[in-house]
């Protein structure tokens, strides 16, 4: 993360400065919906654990075409130190249960905000 | 298998209106993004506007004001709109799908041409 | 909007050399560590054909001989070696902010 370069950023931006850019635009997607996220679309549920953004990129990056979630696909692509394509799954999803971008969105960032109380930047 | 076809009305007068369809096949306009591209003859791509599958529509700066996009996903199509022609319209326009993030235009339609003369 | 100019506009390679063209952004395409740079080929007649994304991405398909690099302003697409196959005009592409845009084109003729 400490190498994490943000949109108007020139150079790294601090991982505490991040996070909270990333807990900024789930929270933004989540009081700005109105009609279904993403129309409904449902991804593969993650362990909130080691490897939680590239897990929640590889789950997120299934969903195409949802202009609500550009910019978090985006910011955990930046997270992520691998390269992560649309089919690609690791063992750090729970893959008999899917649910709604909407509820997705919602429980990473109950655990981001979690994360961020507790100092857990990186 | 994935296809777009771009269909026009190949001659419009100057100062009229175009209107063309893309009928897609293989994947759902509600999950996909398509973009509208022309290229005058001889000359090289302009990216005009996009639908996002969600619906929001983003337009190129220049032509705002010209441009409506819109779509029916239920029947598979996606509409461009331009008004107030000029010659300089003249081209071949594209419709191109985004594939998946980082949202590359993965699938070209053929092209449908455009005349603006009278 | 971002400006991409594409250079040269054309240029000639003899078979089997390498042909490298670049395409400079009026400002960076980069967002949160990624360049959000693409490469096209059209061939004569044809729609164009997604080569490389994000900078330096193979698209699925896409021959080995074909590699994109850079950041921020510059980027270039290389090709090495050259086939007779590969003349045609290549665009780079830009989806850094919303207002999505193309370089003028290089084309590429094969000696």
């Known amino acids: 993360l400490t190498c994490l370069g943000g949109f108007a950023s020139p150079g790294p931006v601090p991982p505490s400065t991040a996070l909270r850019e990333l807990i900024e635009e789930l929270v933004n997607i989540t009081q700005n919906q109105k009609a279904p996220l993403c129309n409904g679309s449902m991804v593969w549920s993650i362990n909130l654990t080691a490897g939680m953004y590239c897990a929640a990129l590889e789950s997120l990056i299934n969903v195409s075409g949802c202009s609500a979630i550009e910019k978090t696909q985006r910011m955990l692509s930046g997270f992520c130190p691998h390269k992560v394509s649309a089919g690609q799954f690791s063992s750090l999803h729970v893959r008999d249960t899917k649910i709604e971008v909407a509820q997705f969105v919602k429980d990473l960032l109950l655990h981001l905000k979690k994360l961020f109380r507790e100092g857990q930047f990186n | 298998e994935v296809q777009l076809k771009e269909s026009g009305p190949g001659l419009v007068a100057p100062g009229g209106s175009l209107s063309i369809t893309c009928t897609v096949s293989?994947?759902?306009?509600?999950?996909?993004?398509i973009n509208w591209v022309r290229q005058p003859p001889g000359k090289g791509l302009e990216w005009l506007g996009m639908i996002w599958g969600d619906g929001r529509i983003d337009y190129a700066d220049a032509l705002k004001s010209r441009l409506s996009i819109s779509k029916d996903s239920s029947k598979s199509q996606v509409f461009l709109e331009m008004t107030s022609l000029r010659t300089d319209d003249t081209a071949t326009y594209y419709c191109?799908?985004?594939?998946?993030?980082?949202?590359?235009?993965?699938?070209w339609g053929q092209g449908t041409s455009v005349t603006v003369s009278s | 909007d971002i400006v991409l100019t594409q250079s040269p506009a054309s240029l000639a390679v003899s078979l089997g050399q390498r042909a490298t063209i670049s395409c400079r952004a009026s400002e960076s395409v980069d967002s949160y560590g990624q360049s959000y740079m693409h490469w096209y080929q059209q061939k004569a007649g044809q729609p164009p054909k997604l080569l490389i994304y994000l900078a330096s991405n193979l698209e699925s398909g896409v021959p080995a001989r074909f590699s994109g690099s850079g950041s921020r302003t510059d980027f270039t697409l290389t090709i090495d070696p050259v086939q007779a196959e590969d003349a045609a005009t290549y665009y780079c592409?830009?989806?850094?902010?919303?207002?999505?845009?193309f370089g003028g084109g290089t084309k590429l003729e094969i000696k």
């Open positions: 191109a799908r985004d594939g998946y993030f980082p949202y590359a235009m993965d699938f």
């Open positions: 592409q830009q989806n850094a902010e919303d207002s999505r845009t």
């Open positions: 293989g994947f759902s306009l509600t999950d996909s993004s």
